[in-house]
């Protein structure tokens, strides 16, 4: 289906508004360092262009790529030496390595000061007075800290971020009702651009037929009543949108998730009976919303797998003429019948699978060689559900701030190499599993807890490959991708850690102390414990416990004296005094 | 020690037929599966097909038809009939032992010193 | 159609030299099943290494590999007299009537 002008067919089929989205959240995600209005005034100058090739596709430069005019017009950029280095080089290039080094030298962690919240009056005059930039800035703040953000859910949030303000700022108490909803839209955010995070991962560092693997698996738990064919058509049409997106085509990722959407809408009946309500939506909801759709119920009677994938004389020669679709319809059958495993269990369980065939079916006797295959699978699914029991014990007898402090401890003491930031990062978002899934009923606890732990230690490898200072996180993140967790579940005390020196200048606070909020007074005692962990990697959780017990009490104690500062600077040496005798 | 010997190679017509075998000494071939792989004169190495212990066999996409793979684990031996060969079947013949372990895998650790087919007239 | 394209198809090099060999797949190549022989004159083929970078028993460890999916990469990280003879890379995939070899490379004497 080839046009003559690529940017004349997306704007044509995207439309104004959302192709100028797009193309701002590119730009922004490129070039992450930008001022707005530098990037609004690149947008603009890409759609005035845009609309020269809609009026005659022959015009000049419209029947070029995407890539080559974005690069050229990324590349336009006066300042692009100074503020992104090397990445300057990349101009120097031809498409498609001019792309491939622009989507490299994307900053998982850039070095942007937090977004700080205005005071409600201050958002809802600023929407008032020119909405458009508003929400345009909204977007470009998003994507330029959030490189991988899926571009067209971005679009979807931006819908939200939009509606909630033209419904709060009408309504009498104006911060009641916006600052939830802006909580809420700032949590599933973060929480979506993680989960895309993981998806661009598998792709890029996996390959598709890792992605592809995945999303059979998940879509035949949410579909289990549509057959392998349907299945495996829509893996294709998804593993079609996310490549695109993660490669930074996102013109072309938006229209073909719309495709998606229609495709699914139209073929309800032979895909899921829950789509219904999601099909009568306006189109950014509508993608949204299949994306999000629940689990439709297995069909009565499935047989058992074993007739197919034990008992069949043909299992070795349908494995071996034809891997990808056998092993692909194993995973299909096995995930349709357990909604209630986790997607990393099940593609645990078609790789144990995979390594059985490969070893007997050039054997003698291969029936004899693979018969207990499926009990084989006990311990993979026992090791999870053991797990989730076992850390979901321990939340609910900590709560959620003590069960992150165990986490940090657990993981500082496995790869006490990685940054303080990064291990209370990413050790709080692993933490957060229990009030998200331990709540939930037996049958979705394992699903929930560790494919969400799969996305938060994904940012983990993520962030370490930019700074890599452990060989066994490269390991754990690098050798399979479905065992990741496995892998770092499996690590130890690090025997090898030369302990940090310790630095009385971690542990000396002050009275700015007090004024922070809740979770910022959290971020600063867990920076704490991690330290002390890197200091005396061996100190037992009683003595942990102890000395942080002792750090409450000492804030506490300094934050109700009337001269906090001087109470700060009498007990914190004390503290750490106390501390270090503590942990001798 | 383990030895894979090649056979039966030699001058043929395009459009005859040769048998080739493939005698295992050293271990028991009903345990292992066997390639057939072929070079022809200064050129690279072309996979024909293989046979597992089993005698399950598959071919390359381009061999199926004109050559078959048996074996007969008695004689602790495989062999490769060739049929309506032409003149680019001339080539070295080789069989080789898949690593035990693997089925589908291109990996051979134990190879013969390979036999000589020549098609000509 | 399977294409296993090795790169480069002869290299001239010294003793000491450190040696790359590419080979490029397409399609990917099923689960890193990919392997490398060495070959010498009149001699059949030797398995040096498999599933992408593990070493045969016996093989020096101045052989290693590495890659996954399509690039594959074979390097000697000092050539040694003995070391001069052609490379293949064999690659398996979904389909086990695809199992392919890479055209070859020559390491000779410079």
């Known amino acids: 289906d080839t046009h003559k002008s690529e940017v004349a067919h997306r704007f044509k089929d995207l439309g104004e508004e959302h192709f100028k989205g797009l193309v701002l959240v590119a730009f922004s995600q490129y070039l992450q360092q930008c001022p707005f209005e530098e990037h609004v005034k690149l947008v603009n100058e890409v759609t005035e262009f845009a609309k020269t090739c809609v009026a005659d596709e022959s015009a000049e430069n419209c029947d070029k790529s995407l890539h080559t005019l974005f690069g050229d017009k990324l590349c336009t950029v006066a300042t692009l030496r100074e503020t992104y280095g090397e990445m300057a080089d990349c101009c120097a290039k031809q498409e498609p390595e001019r792309n491939e080094c622009f989507l490299q030298h994307k900053d998982d962690n850039p070095n942007l000061p937090p977004l700080v919240r205005p005071e409600v009056d201050v958002m809802c005059t600023a929407f008032h007075d020119n909405e458009a930039t508003f929400l345009k800035k909204y977007l470009y703040e998003v994507a330029r800290r959030h490189p991988y953000f899926y571009a067209p859910e971005l679009l979807f949030f931006a819908a939200r971020y939009k509606a909630a303000f033209a419904e709060c700022c009408q309504a009498a108490d104006k911060a009641a009702c916006l600052l939830p909803k802006l909580d809420e839209l700032r949590d599933e955010g973060k929480a979506s651009s993680a989960k895309q995070r993981l998806k661009c991962a598998s792709l890029q560092k996996f390959g598709d037929r890792a992605f592809k693997a995945w999303a059979v698996a998940r879509l035949s738990q949410k579909f289990p009543k549509a057959e392998f064919a349907e299945v495996s058509k829509l893996v294709t049409d998804l593993t079609k949108v996310h490549t695109e997106c993660c490669h930074g085509d996102l013109l072309e990722c938006a229209d073909d998730r719309a495709d998606l959407a229609k495709y699914m809408c139209e073929n309800q009946d032979s895909i899921s009976s829950k789509l219904k309500e999601c099909c009568d939506k306006p189109l950014l909801e509508k993608s949204h919303c299949l994306a999000e759709v629940e689990n439709d119920e297995m069909p009565a009677d499935l047989p058992s797998l074993a007739a197919d994938y034990v008992e069949s004389k043909d299992v070795c020669k349908n494995y071996a003429e034809a891997k990808d679709v056998f092993l692909g319809m194993f995973l299909y059958e096995y995930a349709r019948r357990h909604p209630d495993y986790s997607v990393m269990l099940l593609l645990r369980l078609a790789k144990a699978y995979e390594a059985t065939l490969e070893k007997c079916c050039a054997a003698a006797d291969p029936h004899e060689c693979y018969a207990k295959v499926f009990d084989e699978f006990q311990p993979l699914v026992e090791e999870p559900q053991n797990l989730v029991k076992q850390n979901c014990e321990l939340f609910e007898q900590l709560g959620e701030y003590k069960f992150q402090n165990a986490l940090l401890v657990r993981y500082t003491k496995k790869v006490p190499q990685v940054s303080t930031p990064t291990l209370v990062e990413v050790s709080r978002n692993l933490g957060k599993v229990g009030a998200k899934c331990c709540k939930l009923p037996e049958a979705k606890r394992m699903p929930c807890a560790e494919d969400y732990l799969s996305v938060v230690l994904n940012r983990l490898c993520v962030l370490h490959e930019k700074t890599p200072v452990s060989e066994k996180v490269t390991k754990c993140c690098t050798e399979s991708l479905v065992n990741r967790r496995p892998c770092f579940s499996a690590l130890e005390l690090d025997e090898a850690y030369v302990p940090k020196a310790f630095n009385a200048e971690t542990f000396t606070f002050h009275a700015d102390m007090c004024t922070l909020s809740e979770k910022e007074k959290q971020v600063k005692k867990q920076t704490a414990l991690v330290e002390l962990v890197k200091h005396k990697p061996k100190a037992t959780k009683e003595q942990l416990k102890g000395v942080m017990d002792n750090f409450a009490a000492f804030v506490e104690k300094c934050c109700k004296a009337d001269d906090k500062e001087a109470c700060f600077a009498e007990e914190g040496p004390k503290f750490v005094a106390a501390s270090q005798a503590a942990l001798a | 020690e383990v030895q894979l010997l090649e056979s039966g190679g030699g001058l043929v017509q395009p459009g005859g037929s040769l048998r080739l075998s493939c005698a295992v000494s050293g271990i028991d071939l009903s345990n292992y599966a066997i390639n057939w792989v072929r070079q022809a004169p200064g050129k690279g190495l072309e996979w024909i097909g293989i046979i597992w212990a089993s005698g399950t066999t598959f071919y390359a996409t381009w061999a199926k038809g004109r050559f078959t793979i048996s074996r007969d684990n008695s004689k602790n031996t495989v062999y490769l009939q060739m049929n309506s060969l032409r003149a680019e079947d001339t080539a070295v013949y080789y069989c080789?032992?898949?690593?035990?372990?693997?089925?589908?895998?291109?990996?051979?650790?134990?190879w013969g010193q390979g036999t000589l087919v020549t098609v000509s007239s | 159609d399977i294409q296993m394209t090795q790169s480069p198809s002869s290299v001239s090099a010294s003793v000491g030299d450190r040696v790359t060999i590419t080979c490029q797949s397409s399609?990917?190549?099923?689960?890193?099943?990919l392997s490398w022989y060495q070959q010498k004159p009149g001699k059949a083929p030797k398995l040096l290494i498999y599933?992408?970078?593990k070493l045969t028993s016996g093989v020096p460890s101045r052989f290693s590999g590495s890659g996954s999916g399509t690039d594959f990469t074979l390097t000697i990280s000092s050539l040694q007299p003995e070391d001069f003879a052609t490379y293949y890379c064999g690659g398996g995939y979904s389909s086990i009537s695809d199992t392919t070899f890479g055209g070859g490379t020559k390491v000779e004497i410079k």
């Open positions: 599933e992408a970078s």
């Open positions: 399609p990917s190549v099923w689960s890193n099943f």
């Open positions: 080789a032992r898949t690593v035990p372990g693997y089925s589908t895998a291109p990996y051979f650790d134990l």
